[in-house]
C-alpha cells in the first residue's frame, strides 16, 4: 500500500516546471475511464507534484492513479519515465502494514460500491453509528448482529464491527448503508463524494 | 457509447402480466444498475425499482411491491422488467434507465431507454 | 415517501428571457436533487445532478441552485430548443421519487 502513490510522486518531481504545468494541462483532457470525473482546473493548476499526487490518488485511487499518470507521461513523450512508474507499480507488493488493510486492486473501478471504496473513511468519520444501526436493524442486521455493534466501545469499533458483516451483503444492501448514511452524515457523504 | 435498447409496444388485457425488455451495450453490464421509470399518458415519472446485474439483487418500490419483478440475463446483458395483474392504470411508457454511474452516493439517470409503450385494455 | 413539489405548473415566456422553475422537498434532501429536461415522445435527458453539477453537454445557460427542501433550475436566457417539461427527482432516499413537472411553453 502507498507503492503506486510513491512512484507516482516520484515521476512528477523528476518533472521541470514546464513539463510539470504541461502534465496538468493534459490531464485536463486526457481521456477518462467511464464514471471517473476530472481534477478542477481552478484547484489543479496550482499544485505542486506533491499535492498533485495526493490529489491523483484521492480522485482515481492508487492503480488507476498511476495508470492515468503513465498515460499522461507517454503522451508528453516522456516513454521511459512512463516506463519506470508503472515498473513501479506493478512489482510484487508485500504485505500490508500491521494493522492497515491493504486496498483491493479494483479499489475505484466501477462495480465497487461507495460503501467499499470508503470503507476506511467511514470507520474514521461516521459519528452517528446509533442511528445508521436502527435505519439498518430488521432489514439489513439481525437482533445478533444488531447487538454485537451496540456493544463495541468506541465508534470506529462499531463501524469496523459493522463493516465486518458487509462482505455477506449484497448492493441493494449496502445502498440502505448509503442511504442512512445520507440522511443522517449528508456531509461526510458529500465530502467522501467529492474525493 | 452506452446505448439502452427496449423492446417493442405491447397491448395487453387486464389482470395479465406484461415482461419488457432493455438490452445495454457499450459499458460492462455487472459494473452498473439498471433502473426502471414510468410514464402513464400526459403524467410524470415514477421509479419503480432497480436491479445490480452484478450480484441479481434488486430493490422495489414498495407501491409495485409483488406486482413488479427485476431481472437480468448477464449472457445477454439484458434486464427485464415484469408487471402483473395488470390494470388500465397501468397503461403508460416504461422506461430503463441506467446512472450515470452506480459505485457513486446517489442514482441519477444519464443513459434512457427509448421507451416501451404498454397499452392494457380489455 | 419523500414528495417533491414544482412550481410553476405552466411557465410562459420568450426565447431570450429568463426562466426560473421551483422544487420543493417534503423534507430534507441535503443536495441530493437532479433535474430533467423531456420534449415529447422523447426520454428525459439529464440537465442537473447533485443540485448544481452541469451534466456533460448540457449547455451553460443551465444552472442548478439550492439545499435542504428548496431547489431552483435556472435558464438564463431561453433559446427555442429549450421549451419542454422539467423535472426534479430527488436521490436522497428510497423510493427514489419525481416532481409532477413544469411545463415551459413559448409566450
Known amino acids: 500500500m502507498g507503492r503506486a502513490r510513491d512512484a507516482i510522486l516520484d515521476a512528477l518531481e523528476n518533472l521541470t516546471a514546464e513539463e510539470l504545468k504541461k502534465f496538468k494541462l493534459k490531464l485536463l483532457s486526457v481521456p477518462l475511464r467511464e464514471g471517473y470525473g476530472r481534477i478542477p482546473r481552478g484547484a489543479l493548476l496550482s499544485m505542486d507534484a506533491l499535492d498533485l499526487t495526493d490529489k491523483l490518488v484521492s480522485f482515481y485511487l492508487e492503480t488507476y492513479g498511476a495508470e492515468l499518470t503513465a498515460n499522461v507521461l507517454r503522451d508528453m513523450g516522456l516513454q521511459e519515465m512512463a516506463g519506470q512508474l508503472q515498473a513501479a507499480t506493478h512489482q510484487g507488493s508485500g504485505a500490508a502494514p500491521a494493522g492497515i488493510q491493504a486496498p483491493p486492486q479494483s479499489a475505484a473501478k466501477p462495480g465497487l460500491h461507495f460503501i467499499d471504496q470508503h470503507r476506511a473513511a467511514l470507520i474514521a468519520r461516521v459519528t452517528n453509528v446509533e442511528w445508521l444501526l436502527d435505519a439498518l436493524y430488521g432489514k439489513v442486521l439481525t437482533d445478533e448482529q444488531y447487538q454485537a455493534v451496540r456493544a463495541e466501545p468506541t465508534n470506529p469499533s462499531k463501524m469496523r464491527k459493522l463493516f465486518s458483516f458487509t462482505p455477506a451483503w449484497n448492493w441493494t444492501c449496502k445502498d440502505l448503508l448509503l442511504q442512512a448514511l445520507r440522511e443522517s452524515q449528508s456531509y461526510l457523504v458529500e465530502d467522501l463524494e467529492r474525493s | 457509447q452506452v446505448q439502452l435498447v427496449q423492446s417493442g409496444a405491447e397491448v395487453k388485457k387486464p389482470g395479465s402480466s406484461v415482461k419488457v425488455s432493455c438490452k445495454a451495450s457499450g459499458y460492462t453490464f455487472t459494473d452498473q444498475t439498471i433502473h426502471w421509470v414510468r410514464q402513464a399518458p400526459g403524467q410524470g415519472l415514477e421509479w419503480m425499482g432497480y436491479?445490480?446485474?452484478?450480484?441479481?439483487?434488486?430493490m422495489y418500490n414498495e407501491k409495485f411491491q409483488g406486482r413488479v419483478t427485476i431481472t437480468a440475463d448477464k449472457s445477454t446483458s439484458t434486464a427485464y422488467m415484469e408487471l402483473s395483474s395488470l390494470r388500465s392504470e397501468d397503461t403508460a411508457v416504461y422506461y430503463c434507465a441506467r446512472p450515470l454511474y452506480s459505485y457513486a452516493s446517489y442514482y441519477w439517470f444519464a443513459y434512457w431507454g427509448q421507451g416501451t409503450l404498454v397499452t392494457v385494455s380489455s | 415517501e419523500i414528495v417533491l413539489t414544482q412550481s410553476p405548473a405552466t411557465l410562459s415566456l420568450s426565447p431570450g428571457e429568463r426562466a426560473t422553475l421551483s422544487c420543493h422537498a417534503s423534507q430534507n434532501i441535503n443536495v441530493w436533487l437532479s433535474w430533467y429536461q423531456q420534449k415529447p415522445g422523447q426520454a428525459p435527458r439529464l440537465l442537473i445532478y447533485?443540485?448544481?453539477n452541469l451534466h456533460t453537454g448540457i449547455p451553460a445557460r443551465f444552472s442548478g441552485s439550492g439545499s435542504g427542501t428548496d431547489f431552483t433550475l435556472t435558464i438564463s436566457s431561453l433559446e427555442p430548443e429549450d421549451f419542454a417539461v422539467y423535472y426534479c427527482q430527488q436521490g436522497q432516499s428510497y423510493p427514489l421519487t419525481f416532481g409532477q413537472g413544469t411545463k415551459l411553453e413559448i409566450k
Open positions: 447533485k443540485s448544481s
Open positions: 436491479i445490480y446485474p452484478g450480484d441479481s439483487s434488486a
